[in-house]
């Protein structure tokens, strides 16, 4: 039995289309069959849930249809993509991993990824 470590990149820059992707990797201390991955946003010590997905090991993780997140899983690694980001969404995004089944339950929390979002400049009117 040992603590679960979660690793994620320190900084990610969102694309001009407001899409940010990063990898969340966890060192699984047990043989989990059911894993829950949650993306949290922390701003001024307030924590809110961005999205969450539960998946069975070996299967793909599925976020709800209305979620702004998509992702794929491979072993102890989850590739997360957050869409629809705007400049006001710049902030610290924390990857939380929970090994739900079988017992014991494990909780791992990453240090967070600072996602920078820059709204694209509006196209100038062209005179022809």
């Amino acid at each position: 039995c040992k603590a679960m470590h979660v690793a994620q990149p320190a900084v990610v820059l969102a694309s001009s289309r407001g899409i940010a992707s990063f990898v969340c990797e966890y060192a699984s201390p047990g043989k989990a069959t059911e894993v829950r991955v949650t993306v949290l946003r922390q701003a001024d010590s307030q924590v809110t849930e961005v999205c969450a997905a539960t998946y069975m090991m070996g299967n793909e993780l599925t976020f709800l249809d209305d979620s702004i997140c998509t992702g794929t899983s491979s072993g102890n690694q989850v590739n997360l993509t957050i869409q629809g980001l705007r400049a006001m969404d710049t902030g610290l995004y924390i990857c939380k991993v929970e090994l739900m089944y079988p017992p014991p339950y494990y909780l791992g929390i990453g240090n967070g990824t600072q996602i920078y979002v820059i709204d694209p400049e509006p196209c100038p009117d062209s005179d022809f």
């Epitope: 039995c1 969450a52 924390i94 739900m100 014991p104 909780l107 791992g108 929390i109």
Partner: antibody, heavy 118, light 108 residues
């Protein structure tokens, strides 16, 4: 604001059953793990059980395993603890507490006292 | 299960003094998953510190937490009259979640 209100405690004879309830308000209930923690008179805190999110996963302390069932009704924002085959050592104040998104227990109810005595 | 040991069992101090409370785990605990609670007689516990060192909302800055691995500390820099209470550490990284036996801080 977040509120947790326990009910259902009382005096019960050894071997009998009791169901505790915890009415939650002021937050998105289904996004949080919900726990029961108990405290015997003059003693420390003991974690009892947790039910996660949609209620499909539950974990228990060894001291109540096989005798306790934790459940939740997300449509009613209510947490339950069914305790069977009660023993004198189950006498305690039972607290309902919310698992914050980062895992710690940030809000607690006022507690409900369960006394197991003949 | 992870066993948490707190020391001392009782700490007798005067208002204005510094209090240092220790919590030791039987095996390594993620610092993201260690909390401290304060409890006064007849009241529910109150969250003070989470993630080993982050102060909960509304907690005065005289309370601070530190540590990693198996050794964690709660420090109260200058005791106020309302700080005399029992303090519990807790790990919430692995089930069963466990609390330490508590340290009572009383008035000398």
């Amino acid at each position: 604001q977040v509120q947790l209100v326990e009910s259902g405690g009382g005096v019960v004879q050894p071997g009998r059953s009791l169901r505790l309830s915890c009415a939650a308000s002021g937050f998105t209930f289904s996004s949080h793990g919900m726990h029961w923690v108990r405290q015997a008179p003059g003693k420390g805190l003991e974690w009892v059980a947790v039910t996660w999110y949609d209620g499909s996963n539950k974990h228990y302390a060894d001291s109540v395993k096989g005798r306790a069932t934790i459940s939740r009704d997300n449509s009613k924002n209510t947490l339950y603890l069914q305790m069977n085959s009660l023993r004198a050592e189950d006498t305690a104040v039972y607290y309902c507490t919310r698992g914050e998104l980062l895992g710690h227990f940030d809000y607690w109810g006022q507690g409900t006292l369960v006394t197991v005595s003949s | 299960e992870i066993v948490l040991t707190q020391s001392p069992g009782t700490l007798s101090l005067s208002p204005g003094e510094r209090a240092t409370l220790s919590c030791r785990a039987s095996q390594s605990v993620s610092s993201s998953c260690l909390a401290w609670y304060q409890q006064k007689p007849g009241q529910a516990p109150r969250l003070l510190i989470y993630g080993a060192s982050s102060r909960a909302t509304g907690i005065p800055d005289r309370f601070s937490g530190s540590g990693s691995g198996t050794d964690f500390t709660l420090t109260i820099s200058r005791l106020e009259p309302e700080d005399f209470a029992v303090y519990y550490c807790q790990q919430y990284g692995i089930s069963p979640f466990t609390f330490g036996p508590g340290t009572k801080v009383d008035i000398k």
